[in-house]
């Protein structure tokens, strides 16, 4: 008995195609190892027709492809466009040869059965609708017409003219003339299910003189669309389901052994599971939507379906286009953390995937919102200014090659907490979903900025420090400008031992930035960071108002945004070892579609992108970089 | 509450036949993979076969080793109902016939991912 189990028996229809499942054991060597598939001969020998090393004959050329799920311990041979020919023994297996592990598969392709020559044939999908035409001699004008369908003794009644309708077809099926034309009448049967597939005719008249005509109805369920996709990807489901159904709800679907549960309509429900990582995008007026899940999980592979219906949820005998998805676990995008967690006052330093290769890919980050059907408002990018209620506090410093940018979050408040995307306009498997979580501060911040109540004068010299505790004291520290194109790091010269200290003095730790002297351009925000190499870890924020000099003028309280920096200077809390355990942003790289697959955000990013420089690591905040200096004690 | 319903088992003699009905009425049928399977006195549950359709004109059919060649699988979609045409049948084929349905299309052998189970029909093969 072969440990490798399918399908003894398929059998299909000339055209159709055919999607043939081969199980096989759960072993390392049996993941691995070449799957094929072949066709018995009378000699005994099977001759291989595809094998997942690549392999592809010339009669399968274009229309055959055969996938191996190690995670499911099953590989795939999906045929097309299937002839007559097709039919015959074959074998699914596993081995470099074709003598290893194998299983018999018989498969027959029939002709679509023969129908009566005058035989009209209808082919319609599951939920659409059918007229059937039924043409009439003039002589048979004032008689009774009808529609039947035939059972296996009789054909049974379905509507006549005479308003008698069957019950199982009441409310949608109509029989109806169009205009003046005394030598056709119609039938509309709506909603269409499985069950109303079948030969029908159509009669006007009784008796021999009687006009009847044969109808086939097909009615058929779409075929379901293989999508193969990479762990932590992303996928957009673009559902068409026609004009008819334009102003009905729309929803998305999964299979699960019973029902198919709803994991997105239009009518608000969304999935606990794919919280911060679904939309759904009405595209236009003639039913079109799409639904995009960025961050995909093994567990979210599966049977999808969309839909439209009043009440949001699958009903028979309506519109629906399905899709198979498969997760492939072996995924070009690297495994990062997925939550990231900050404290209130604090800072999170997100780390953002995109692929290498496109380096100058416009990077943005946008803050995922799940009211009505979910949108994702950009925030900041490299060509979008910084949103105004982020003023002071948001900025993306990309690093080009290194396949990631960062985007830097400080003076946490717990509001701030919810799911963030990583996107760029280059290749939207690389959209990543972040959640964002922030707690109440407990201890004392790692960076502190004093003096705090920071107003300098016009044409006077203004020093800022900013303490840091030894933890940091191997690590670059930084103080930059912030605008909204971003936080451009300010030139600076390292008068501090950077040597390894055998001890280390808490107190004098720090690090100062001085205006010399204070012009009116330097008003504004200022960062205080620290990073080693490119990864940037904890910052701290500091409004600097500006003011002339008056005489016996007091300092005069920097404005509200400021109020809000002591705050967070006086609360914000991180663990020990900078942000490499709770603090560093390391997304899950919960990749996306591309920026018309989802409008929010692609028509927002074109909202935002500014003509203006987008802030980089090594910008200049200003031309005359000699007024400041960093000095490290 | 959705229901399938078994019926057509009985008593018959080693080497005679049977065909089992499940009819599942308030089934979106079409979605289905639909599957039998049987359980003796003191034994567990085993699969026996399973009819997957993919709304058009392909059917892929199931079958266990013990029950290959012996037995055929068919389903009436217009009636919602499936089929399983037992031949040759031996004494050790007495059991509890079950129908079950699903909408996962994993492996079809497993129980558990069945959702849907009938009462079950008796069938006895005397020697």
């Known amino acids: 008995k072969s440990p490798i189990f399918g399908p003894q028996e398929v059998s299909s229809i000339e055209g159709d195609s055919v999607s043939i499942t081969c199980y096989y054991p759960d072993t390392s060597v049996n993941r691995h190892t070449r799957k094929y598939w072949c066709r018995q001969g009378a000699s005994g020998m099977c001759t291989t027709l595809i094998s997942s090393n690549g392999y592809l004959s010339k009669e399968y050329s274009g229309r055959a492809n055969l996938i191996n799920f190690p995670e499911n311990n099953t590989f795939v041979i999906n045929i097309e466009q299937l002839t007559q020919d097709d039919t015959g023994s074959y074998k699914c297996g596993l081995g470099t040869s074709n003598r290893g592990l194998s299983f018999d598969v018989s498969l027959e392709v029939s002709q679509v059965p023969e129908l009566p020559s005058d035989t009209h044939v209808y082919t319609k999908d599951i939920g659409r609708n059918v007229t059937i035409e039924c043409p009439f001699k003039r002589e048979n004008a004032p008689s009774k017409k009808s529609l039947c369908k035939k059972t296996n003794q009789s054909c049974e009644l379905v509507i006549d003219s005479t308003e008698k309708v069957n019950p199982s077809y009441i409310g949608r099926a109509k029989l109806f003339m169009k205009g003046t034309d005394l030598t056709v009448f119609y039938v509309n049967i709506s909603h269409l299910t499985h069950n109303d597939a079948g030969l029908y005719i159509c009669q006007a008249g009784e008796g021999p003189s009687a006009d009847k005509k044969n109808v086939d109805l097909q009615v058929l369920a779409p075929e379901p669309e293989l999508l193969y996709k990479d762990l932590r990807s992303s996928v957009t489901f673009e559902c068409d389901l026609g004009r008819e159904v334009a102003n009905e709800a729309k929803y998305l679907c999964r299979m699960n052994k019973e029902t198919c549960d709803v994991i997105i309509n239009t009518l608000g429900k969304r999935d606990p599971d794919f919280e911060g990582r679904i939309l759904i995008t009405p595209k236009d007026d003639n039913g079109r939507f799409s639904v995009l899940i960025t961050g995909l999980r093994k567990e979210d592979a599966g049977h999808y379906q969309c839909g439209a219906h009043s009440s949001g949820l699958p009903q028979e005998g309506w519109p629906i286009q399905t899709w198979q998805l498969f997760v492939n676990e072996e995924s070009t995008i690297p495994n990062r953390r997925s939550v990231v967690k900050g404290v209130t006052g604090g800072s999170v330093a997100i780390a953002c995937p995109y692929n290498p290769k496109e380096s100058s890919s416009l990077k943005y980050w946008c803050r995922w919102e799940g009211d009505g059907n979910g949108h994702c408002p950009v925030l900041v990018g490299t060509q979008a200014q910084v949103q105004e209620e982020y003023e002071g506090r948001l900025a993306l410093f990309d690093q080009p090659g290194n396949g990631t940018y960062t985007v830097i979050l400080n003076q946490l408040t717990t509001e701030d907490a919810g799911f963030y995307w990583c996107l760029t306009n280059g290749d939207s498997r690389w959209r990543t979903t972040i959640e964002l979580q922030v707690a109440e501060a407990t201890r004392e911040p790692n960076l502190e900025v004093t003096p705090q109540n920071a107003t300098a004068v016009l044409g006077e010299t203004f020093t800022v420090s900013c303490h840091y505790p030894c933890k940091f004291y191997s690590q670059e520290k930084y103080w930059c400008k912030w605008s909204n194109k971003g936080c451009h790091i300010l030139p600076s010269h390292d008068e501090g031992a950077r040597q390894s200290s055998v001890s280390c003095d808490q107190s004098s730790q720090l690090v100062s930035m001085t205006l010399n002297p204070v012009s009116k351009e330097d008003e504004g925000w200022y960062w205080c960071g620290v990073k080693q190499g490119q990864t940037y870890g904890e910052t701290t924020a500091i409004y600097i108002a500006v003011e002339e000099r008056t005489r016996g003028s007091s300092h005069v309280n920097p404005t509200d945004a400021n109020a809000r920096a002591k705050v967070a200077l006086e609360e914000e809390v991180v663990d020990s070892s900078i942000s490499e355990k709770e603090n560093k942003a390391i997304p899950n790289p919960g990749p996306f579609a591309n920026e018309r697959e989802i409008q929010n955000v692609g028509d927002q990013a074109q909202e935002n992108r500014a003509s203006g420089d987008a802030g980089s690591a090594d910008g200049q905040s200003r031309s005359s970089s000699s007024k400041h200096h960093h000095h490290h004690h | 509450e959705v229901q399938v319903v078994e019926s057509g088992g009985g008593l018959v003699q080693a080497g005679g036949s049977l065909k089992l009905a499940c009819a599942a009425p308030?089934?979106?049928?079409?979605?289905?993979?639909m599957g039998w399977f049987r359980q003796a006195p003191g034994q567990e549950r085993e699969f026996v076969a399973a009819?997957?359709?993919?709304?058009?004109?392909?059917?892929?059919?199931y079958y266990a080793d013990s029950v290959k060649g012996r037995s055929t699988i068919s389903r009436d979609n217009a009636k919602n109902t499936v089929y399983l045409q037992m031949n040759s049948l031996k004494p050790e084929d007495t059991a509890v016939y079950y129908c079950?349905?699903?909408?996962?299309?994993?492996?079809?052998?497993?129980?558990?991912?069945?959702?849907?189970w009938g009462q079950g029909t008796q069938v006895t093969v005397s020697s």
């Open positions: 079950a349905a699903t909408t996962v299309l994993t492996d079809p052998r497993v129980l558990n991912e069945y959702a849907t």
């Open positions: 308030g089934l979106t049928f079409s979605s289905y993979r």
């Open positions: 009819i997957d359709w993919n709304g058009r004109g392909t059917y892929y059919r």
